[in-house]
């Protein structure tokens, strides 16, 4: 009685259970009455990352420097190349097919999370008591200067974009 289902790492063809090819190898010939499955290693710059019955290996991803990409991890016969972005850039998608410049946080906003090769800068508005007066991909919101600790008084209130201005205490008081 021919099988209707096969074991793990096998596939059903012509009423027979054939072994799948291991990662890093492609299928040449299905198994037969006389032979095991015939598999061949993937070529240079090719890979297959699963037990498979593919007749062609996949090409390794190309990290195009014109798109701001560079190789993070070189591919093997069993794994694809992993691309990342040049310094100051990050991937536009999980697949990292192209890069864009890291976003800067405008004045009034500070960096909550510095960008990585795969994620953009995360900005947050400076809360009361903090400010940022620059456009930056690294600067956090800074706390207003504490005039009191310097034996000074606030002459000009701070905003989310400006620090407080301190001045000497009024001596007439």
């Amino acid at each position: 009685e021919p099988p209707t289902a096969c074991r793990e790492k096998q596939y059903l063809i012509n009423s027979q259970c054939c072994s799948l090819c291991q990662p890093g190898q492609k299928l040449v010939s299905d198994c037969t009455e006389f032979t095991e499955t015939e598999c061949l290693p993937c070529g240079e710059s090719e890979f297959l990352d699963t037990w498979n019955r593919e007749t062609h290996c996949h090409q390794h991803k190309y990290c195009d420097p014109n798109l701001g990409l560079r190789v993070q991890q070189k591919g093997t016969s069993e794994t694809d190349t992993i691309c990342t972005c040049e310094e100051g850039w990050h991937c536009t998608s999980e697949a990292c097919e192209s890069c864009v410049l890291h976003r800067s946080c405008s004045p009034g906003f500070g960096v909550k999370q510095i960008a990585t090769g795969v994620s953009d800068t995360i900005c947050e508005p400076c809360p009361v008591g903090f400010f940022s007066n620059v456009s930056s991909a690294f600067e956090k919101c800074h706390p207003w200067t504490s005039c009191e600790t310097k034996d000074l008084v606030v002459q000009q209130a701070g905003t989310n974009k400006t620090d407080v201005v301190c001045g000497p205490q009024d001596r007439l008081r």
């Epitope: 040449v28 010939s29 009455e33 006389f34 015939e38």
Partner: antibody
Framework: QVQLVESGGGLVKPGGSLRLSCAVS????????VYWIRQAPGKGLEWMGM???????DYSTSVKGRFTISKDNAKTSVYLQMSSLRAEDTAVYYC???????WGQGTLVTVSS | ELQLTQSPLSLPVTLGQPASISCRSS???????????LHWYLQRPGQSPRLLIY???NRFSGVPDRFSGSGSGTDFTLKISRVEAEDVGVYYC?????????FGGGTKLEIK
Amino acid sequence: QVQLVESGGGLVKPGGSLRLSCAVSGFSLSRYSVYWIRQAPGKGLEWMGMMWGGGSTDYSTSVKGRFTISKDNAKTSVYLQMSSLRAEDTAVYYCVRTDGDYWGQGTLVTVSS
Amino acid sequence: ELQLTQSPLSLPVTLGQPASISCRSSQSLASSSGNTYLHWYLQRPGQSPRLLIYKVSNRFSGVPDRFSGSGSGTDFTLKISRVEAEDVGVYYCSQSTHVPWTFGGGTKLEIK
């Protein structure tokens, strides 16, 4: 449909050479393996060797070094190049596909002076 | 090189009676994948061989169910439950587990 047709047999002197061809149709030689078998007059079957789909070859100990199997995927033919032939190489030579029961009709090789 | 030894060399049988042919291997025919590549062929007079049984016990398409194969490791048997006139010829066992592939010497079945 699947077909294998041998040709190239004939009379050859001891020490001579001969190339047998196995023309196939109905399947691709890059996806299927083919082997050669011979049968001397009134004798049993003897496996000569095979050409795998991937291009590698295997041979029987009796012909290794004297016989060479090759293929031309484009011309859809498998070849058996025989050299240093001996009287005991006289036989009907068959090419066979390695699945199912697909045999050629056979070609007779006679090695005699 | 692996040897396949068939017995008997000659097998006279009465029509309608059973027949049995043995094939012994000089080493195990179980492959690393668990398959056993032991096959049986029939060569009728003047014809090329025809596959009867593959991988020990699987009847090839179109082969009557009076033919059956059994065995494991190094010991294998071909049985014909009721011999018919068309079963006359030479039976060969063959293995494709180990390279080089090999054939048994053959068993000639004839009608008594």
